[in-house]
């Protein structure tokens, strides 16, 4: 599709006569008829196959024709065509005299013709005007002409359609030859493919507009080269999407089992030393002067009743001091100056002489103790609670408060870590002093037999077109993660253009 343009510049008819030689009255009111047709070696009358156009009266006798293109006028004359420009043409230009206002051919007398010119030749599409002048015995016509393509048509014969666009279907302008020229940031045959942010990961990233980098599921970061850990992961990271690789001090499938309770919770008080002893289990070693599971209780040094033979204990800044009853001396009132003759045994205790009467010993009835049977038995003094349990006096009886992981009257029983069936996939659980151990069946490994180690379905490289292979551990099958442009269970089929979101 294009336009043949004819620019009339000057018409000279000095004598103001018709082709017949008869003068016009009062002068030749001149208008033009133009006929454009296919190439003829000898231009003959007949259909104007490429089109016709007429002008209004442009002047009388001799006149210059004003260029009216800017004002929307009719010069240059436009002869549009809707076919491939053949490169050759025939052109007939007739000058006519209009005695009245009706310019229709049937309204004019046949001798109203002033002049007729006919040319033919080759004409390539282009912006440049060809200037021509045709002279007869009585008239002269100066004109120029050219062929240009209509909007959105390009090429040597205006046959190439190209309409610039900036939408979902393409982002381009048109080159003079009709080829597409992509707008900045776009690429592809139809400039539909955005150029992603520089460095955006080829497989993990994509973009819907230029300089963007959007990540496919499981990836994150500016360039989509960082993975996202599993949804349930608590204290772990990943090297491929949805993994959960535990941070130091954490364990379990989702890294939610605390293997370093001491560091994460600092349970021991008053400067005590903390030792991890299994999952969520720990032991506090108290500094002198403190007691309790977490060393939270301050210990009076007199609480251990260090004074014997009825001596009374007094706390001091640097320890304690025993005030001894009459007949006793020593740091703990352990030395006696008495003999059995002094009846030193209280609460029905019986006295026995020693060292030829220089010394004695009391044999105490049940529920009494001390070198003089002066103390009621403290049921906790014998430290009956095992495994670091805390002994509590409860009137005539006693009880043990056990540390985590122990039970029984005297904390003598170890709570089985295997009671929870922690070993996955039929693993066998073994209780150890500080936790448990799983013996895994064939095909599984890991601290809790949670890792499947069966045949790698990806070993045979089943994925095509540089796809990434992942083993589906639950079914021993593989899954192919296709690169952009391929689909299929093995990424074996190329995708037709243009794709929608490639994933």
């Amino acid at each position: 599709s294009g336009v043949f343009q004819l620019q009339l510049q000057e018409f000279i008819n000095e004598r103001g006569v018709l082709a017949s030689g008869r003068p016009c009255e009062p002068g030749c009111r001149t208008f033009f008829r133009v006929c454009l047709k296919h190439f003829q070696a000898v231009v003959s009358p007949g259909p104007c196959t490429f089109g016709t156009v007429s002008t209004p009266v442009l002047g009388t006798n001799s006149f210059a024709v004003r260029d009216d293109s800017s004002g929307g006028g009719r010069n240059p004359l436009q002869l549009p065509f809707n076919f491939t420009w053949p490169g050759t043409f025939s052109l007939i230009i007739e000058a006519w005299h209009a005695p009245g206002d009706d310019l229709r051919p049937e309204a004019l007398p046949p001798d109203a013709l002033i002049s007729k010119i006919a040319i033919q030749g080759s004409l390539a599409v282009g912006q440049n005007w060809l200037l021509d002048e045709q002279t007869s015995t009585l008239t002269r016509l100066r004109y120029s002409y050219r062929v240009i393509c209509s909007d959105n048509y390009y090429g040597d014969n205006c046959s190439r359609l190209c309409k610039k666009r900036n939408d979902h279907f393409g982002h381009y302008v048109c080159q003079p030859d009709g080829n597409l020229s992509c707008l900045p940031g776009w690429t592809g045959e139809y400039c539909q493919q955005p150029i992603c942010l520089s460095g955006c990961h080829e497989q993990n990233g994509y973009c819907s507009k230029p300089a963007e980098c959007l990540c496919r599921p499981g990836w994150q970061g500016r360039l989509c080269n960082e993975c996202i850990p599993h949804n349930g992961c608590r204290h772990g990271t990943c090297s491929t999407p949805w993994q959960c690789t535990c941070d130091e001090g954490w364990g379990g499938l989702f890294c939610d089992q605390d293997l370093n309770y001491c560091t994460h919770h600092s349970p021991c008080k008053n400067g005590a030393t903390c030792s991890n002893s299994g999952q969520r289990s720990y032991t506090c070693t108290c500094r002198p002067g403190y007691t309790g599971v977490d060393c939270e209780l301050e210990l009076s040094e007199c609480d251990s009743n260090p004074c014997r033979n009825g001596g009374s204990c007094k706390d001091q800044e640097d320890g304690y001091h025993c005030l001894c009853p009459p007949g006793y001396y020593g740091l703990h009132c352990e030395h006696s100056t008495l003999s059995c003759a002094d009846s030193p045994c209280f609460n029905g205790g019986s006295c026995r002489e020693r060292n030829q009467g220089a010394n004695y010993a009391c044999e105490c009835p049940p529920n009494f103790t001390g070198s003089n049977c002066e103390k009621k038995v403290d049921r906790c003094t014998s430290n009956p609670c095992a495994n670091g349990g805390q002994c509590l006096n409860r009137g005539p009886s006693r009880m043990c408060r056990c540390r985590p992981g122990f039970t029984g009257t005297y904390c003598e029983l170890h709570v089985s870590d295997c009671a929870r069936n922690p070993c996955a996939h039929g693993g066998t659980c073994h209780d150890l002093e500080n936790g448990l151990m799983c013996t895994c069946p064939a095909g599984f490994s890991g601290r809790r037999c949670e890792v499947r180690t069966s045949i790698d379905a990806c070993a045979s490289s089943p994925c095509f077109n540089r796809a990434t292979c992942y083993t589906d551990l639950s079914t021993d099958t593989f899954v192919c993660n296709c690169p952009y442009g391929f689909v299929g269970s093995r990424c074996e089929f190329p995708v037709g253009l243009p794709p929608s979101f490639p994933w």
């Epitope: 499981g218 994150q220 949804n231 608590r234 204290h235 929608s500 994933w503």
Partner: antibody, heavy 118, light 107 residues
Framework: EVQLVESGGGLVQPGGSLRLSCAAS????????MAWVRQAPGKGLEWVAT????????YYRDSVKGRFTISRDNSKSTLYLQMNSLRAEDTAVYYC???????????WGQGTLVTVSS | DIQMTQSPSSLSASVGDRVTITCRAS??????LAWYQQKPGKSPKLLIF???NLADGVPSRFSGSGSGTDSTLTISSLQPEDFATYFC?????????FGQGTKLEIK
């Protein structure tokens, strides 16, 4: 136990600003991408913004771009949403959530109500 | 943006019933779909991710299925605590988008 606790919501006039905070615990905050999701009264859920864990890359829904800023302080295990030039249509309960724009939102806070009204 | 359309928008059922909620995406989301449960005045809770994977601690009566553009949430035997609003969400394409919700009420 994973916990996300939002704060900072309230009543604000159109054109005003608010800063929401979300205190995270029970997981290693710096290892995970985080997001804000909102829910207008009686309406559905709408993703607002996301921040990556790796390099702090941020993404926003079109209607809040240029007005809202998501940020994080890994040393305090805290996520933030600075909201400027607030509009009536921003009125919603704002939830802090663990997730990215291309992953499920695995954990959610209890939400904080933002009311934009004159 | 991908449109997510849930159906029905509300549903009445009885304890013990089998219930199905569907979610349709305006284009293929390649199984990158999650389901959430939300009770009045509470925050949403993740039930299912990647179309058919049960989230940690979610009862096995919940299940998900589907591919391409259509996904389904099924509750095999309704319990009293299951009456809530359910949302689907796609995370295949940016930005992530949610369905409008399905309110599950006691008949």
């Amino acid at each position: 136990e994973v916990q996300l606790v939002e704060s900072g919501g309230g009543l604000v006039q159109p054109g005003g600003s608010l800063r929401l905070s979300c205190a995270a615990s029970g997981f290693t905050f710096s290892n995970f991408p985080m997001a804000w999701v909102r829910q207008a009264p009686g309406k559905g859920l709408e993703w607002v913004a996301t921040i990556s864990s790796s390099d702090g890359t941020t993404y926003y829904r079109d209607s809040v771009k240029g007005r809202f800023t998501i940020s994080r302080d890994n040393s305090k295990s805290t996520l933030y949403l600075q909201m400027n030039s607030l509009r009536a249509e921003d009125t919603a309960v704002y939830y802090c959530s663990r997730g990215y724009y291309n992953s499920p939102f695995a954990y959610w806070g209890q939400g904080t109500l933002v009311t934009v009204s004159s | 943006d991908i449109q997510m359309t849930q159906s029905p928008s509300s549903l009445s059922a009885s304890v013990g019933d089998r219930v199905t909620i569907t979610c349709r995406a305006s284009e293929d989301i390649y199984s990158n779909l999650a389901w959430y449960q939300q009770k009045p005045g509470k925050s949403p809770k993740l039930l299912i991710f990647d179309t058919n994977n049960l989230a940690d601690g979610v009862p096995s009566r919940f299940s998900g299925s589907g591919s391409g553009t259509d996904s389904t949430l099924t509750i095999s035997s309704l319990q009293p605590e299951d009456f809530a609003t359910y949302f689907c969400q796609q995370y295949n394409n940016y930005p992530p988008t949610f369905g409008q919700g399905t309110k599950l009420e006691i008949k």
